[in-house]
């Protein structure tokens, strides 16, 4: 099936300039979606503290081709990878240089996806095989989430056992597009 094919085949990673050239971690079988701007799902972060806005984590942009078996996307798609351990935003940039590397005490914070989006992708296949159209989920933003030992195990499936499952959040509606717009729209990705 397509998911397995993506994990096995989609290895052509093109880091954007200014980002680290390491490949993103293996994507797990996760799923988080965005909610309507006017919809009935408010942000829901039950394990976060009031000052969670003071915590920061890194969003790495990667551009990759999506593959499904022998078929590859006509255009690369840009995705975010949530990287690093969360720390107080004011300490992250120069913390090491000052010798004040932040160590968490108490609850653990992890950098995990906050919102996802769906994107249409056209896959071109070799040997005259007909192209395929698929929709993929891509990370739209990252956040710091506080983990506690009371987390349900089902919430720790996404990124190994170190991260809680992200929630869907709100996002602004992208520009309208026709039903035919199935190729990766990198100009509006982020």
């Amino acid at each position: 099936q397509g998911w397995q094919a993506f994990k096995n085949d989609a290895t052509e990673i093109i880091p954007e300039l200014g980002e680290y050239p390491e490949p993103p971690p293996e994507l797990e079988n996760n799923k988080t979606m965005n909610r309507a701007e006017n919809g009935g799902r408010p942000p829901h972060h039950p394990f976060e503290t009031k000052d969670v806005s003071e915590y920061s984590c890194r969003e790495l942009h990667f551009t990759r081709y999506v593959t499904d078996g022998p078929c590859r996307s006509a255009k690369p798609v840009t995705e975010l990878v949530c990287s690093g351990q969360c720390g107080p935003a004011r300490l992250l940039p120069n913390a090491i240089g000052r010798g004040k590397w932040w160590r968490p005490s108490g609850p653990d914070f992890r950098c995990i996806p906050d919102r996802y989006r769906a994107q249409r992708v056209q896959l071109l296949c070799p040997g005259g095989e007909a192209p395929r159209a698929r929709k993929v989920r891509l990370v739209a933003s990252c956040k710091c989430k506080r983990l506690t030992r009371f987390h349900n195990q089902s919430e720790l499936k996404d990124f190994g056992t170190e991260a809680a499952r992200p929630q869907k959040g709100r996002k602004p509606r992208p520009r309208a597009r026709s039903a035919k717009a199935n190729q990766a729209e990198l100009e509006n990705a982020y």
């Epitope: 799923k31 979606m33 006017n38 989006r117 192209p131 159209a133 929630q167």
Partner: antibody, heavy 121, light 109 residues
């Protein structure tokens, strides 16, 4: 594995409203894009609306706009579909359906057992 | 709103092959409509057989396949079994809004 359990059968009078619930287990509701489909007795399936992750909003079928409201209670992982100004032709089995939990976006992979709504005076 | 058309009924012999089609009032069905196919048996909820034109699911028997054929979406059943007798629905994606076809009653005789 995603499981959807819907509320029980309802009998309503014309002009009234009905609110059908769909309880999610296996995953949290926030991880799923919920859609609602109905089927009148002896008839085909009819899409009523659902969450569109491409645009980040709930889209309603033109036929039901202004009469249907789809909401969610994330604290209980329960989705709701409310249909107002009921008429006899709204008598149907109402299904909730969600996508799969994978990299590829596939809608309508998991279905509730259906809720029969009868509209009769 | 678009209208999606299917054959009202089809009959196939056990072991035989049959193709169900799905057309759109707006023109040819393409991969950009992400055609879905569902099977529904009496008293049961539908279940997905095919997504995105041709993508089978783990529970879809190998004898079912999806494709595009002459401007329509098609579901082909090769080697029909008695248990394949059911109603089959196609669904097309019109830019985030979906429309079901009227369904095809498939009889295995």
């Amino acid at each position: 594995e995603v499981q959807l359990v819907q509320s029980g059968a309802e009998v309503k009078k014309p002009g009234a409203s009905v609110k059908v619930s769909c309880k999610v287990s296996g995953y949290t509701l926030t991880e799923l894009s919920m859609h609602w489909v109905r089927q009148a007795p002896g008839k085909g399936l009819e899409w009523m609306g659902g969450f569109d992750p491409e645009h980040g909003e709930t889209i309603y079928a033109q036929k039901f706009q202004g009469r249907v409201t789809m909401t969610e209670d994330t604290s209980t992982d329960t989705a709701y579909m409310e249909l107002s100004s009921l008429r006899s032709e709204d008598t149907a089995v109402y299904y909730c359906a969600t996508d799969s939990v994978s990299f590829w976006e596939k809608f309508f992979q998991h279905w509730g057992q259906g809720t029969l709504v009868t509209v009769s005076s | 709103q678009a209208v999606v058309t299917q054959e009202p009924s089809l009959t196939v012999s056990p072991g035989g092959t049959v193709t169900l089609t799905c057309g759109s009032s707006t023109g040819s069905v393409t991969i950009d409509h992400y055609p879905y196919w569902f099977q529904q048996k009496p008293g049961q909820a539908p279940r997905t057989l095919i997504s995105d034109t041709d993508d089978k699911h783990s529970w879809t028997p190998a004898r079912f396949s999806g494709s595009l054929l002459g401007g329509k979406a098609a579901l082909t059943l090769s080697g029909a079994q008695p248990e394949d007798e059911a109603e089959y629905y196609c669904l097309l994606d019109y830019g985030g809004s979906f429309v079901f076809g009227g369904g095809t009653k498939l009889t295995v005789l």
